[in-house]
């Protein structure tokens, strides 16, 4: 089968600081040296890009400076962290992997990770 399978967890709960981490793992049909990883958010059948990074195998994942994502790679596994999340950002986050080089190109799309974000309760003022 000429297809690339991408696995990611079904559900992740963001921390109280609005940080969510999950692993995106892909079964590579070829020996790629250049890989692009994109995180997409799907809400009401609308898909928007959250962040993207291209990396050379063996090198670190580098997102843009203003990106809300960070990540590390190890073989065919990418550890993704999304920060600055709020309750309104709760939704399905899809990991998309593209084997860019060498040919042939392969596309892999995960089933998505449902990230739940709960805004922390504000601390009550304390009287001393």
């Amino acid at each position: 089968c000429k297809a690339m399978h991408v696995a990611q967890p079904a559900v992740v709960l963001a921390s109280s600081r609005g940080i969510a981490s999950f692993v995106c793992e892909y079964a590579s049909p070829g020996k790629a040296t250049e890989v692009r990883v994109t995180v997409l958010r799907q809400a009401d059948s609308q898909v928007t890009e959250v962040c993207a990074a291209t990396y050379m195998m063996g090198n670190e994942l580098t997102f843009l400076d203003d990106s809300i994502c960070t990540g590390t790679s190890s073989g065919n596994q990418v550890n993704l962290t999304i920060q600055g999340l709020r309750a309104m950002d709760t939704g399905l986050y899809i990991c998309k992997v593209e084997l860019m080089y060498p040919p042939p190109y392969y596309l892999g799309i995960g089933n998505g990770t449902q990230i739940y974000v709960i805004d922390p309760e504000p601390c009550p003022d304390s009287d001393f």
């Epitope: 089968c1 000429k2 297809a3 690339m4 399978h5 049909p29 250049e34 692009r36 994109t38 997409l40 898909v47 928007t48 890009e49 993207a52 291209t54 998309k96 593209e98 860019m100 080089y101 040919p103 042939p104 190109y105 392969y106 596309l107 799309i109």
Partner: antibody, heavy 118, light 108 residues
């Protein structure tokens, strides 16, 4: 709104060159792979070439490899197809298309006709 | 290269009838990477279905896609006058990107 507009088609003699352009608007051009697809009169769709994101990675269909060059200028939101050594069987309507977030070709231009004839 | 074969070549039906179009792949295609397009004369193709079964934005629910492996189907539950056109299936999971030869749905 999201739009692709091709230009540059015309009638050209075999062996000559032509450059097609595709102007994009309404979306972040550099975030998408862009394809050229052609359709010879009365036939189906034939994929021609793709260029990804920053423009470093390109792929071509075998019939055009070595003759056609795909490029993009992200600062101008424009995709190009330089067609050299044109042959009769390159006669077709040429479409540019965007590779959507989930991979399918979700936005298409209206097409530009290229006729190779002596 | 993955070869896609569509059948029938032409489908002659009346408005209100159900249309069933087939697309068969020469090797297994992940359902995540199969699309259907509609093309009317003198117009560009329009994305109808992606991921074998998900409708693109603005596509009416009379269009549905199904299938997996090597066999995929596009169904139009009740043909409207504007549905008479040519339909193409396409795989986009690996290069080269390939399409079927098309099925023409014409008015009987």
């Amino acid at each position: 709104q999201v739009q692709l507009v091709e230009s540059g088609g015309g009638v050209v003699q075999p062996g000559r060159s032509l450059r097609l352009s595709c102007a994009a608007s309404g979306f972040t051009f550099s975030s998408y792979g862009m394809h050229w697809v052609r359709q010879a009169p009365g036939t189906g769709l034939e994929w021609v070439a793709v260029i990804w994101y920053e423009g470093r990675n390109k792929y071509y269909a075998d019939p055009v490899k070595g003759r056609f060059t795909i490029s993009r200028d992200n600062s101008k939101n424009t995709l190009y197809l330089q067609m050299n050594s044109l042959r009769d069987d390159d006669t077709a309507v040429y479409y540019c298309a965007r590779a959507g977030d989930l991979g399918a070709f979700d936005i298409w231009g209206q097409g530009t006709m290229v006729t190779v004839s002596s | 290269e993955i070869v896609l074969t569509q059948s029938p070549g032409t489908l002659s039906l009346s408005p209100g009838e159900r249309a069933t179009l087939s697309c068969r792949a020469s090797q297994s295609v992940s359902s995540s990477y199969l699309a259907w397009y509609q093309q009317k004369p003198g117009q560009a193709p329009r994305l109808l279905i992606y991921g074998a079964s998900s409708r693109a934005t603005g596509i009416p629910d009379r269009f549905s896609g199904s299938g997996s492996g090597t066999d995929f189907t596009l169904t139009i539950s009740r043909l409207e006058p504007e549905d008479f056109a040519v339909y193409y299936c396409q795989q986009y999971g690996s290069s080269p990107w390939t399409s079927g030869q098309g099925t023409k749905v014409e008015i009987k």
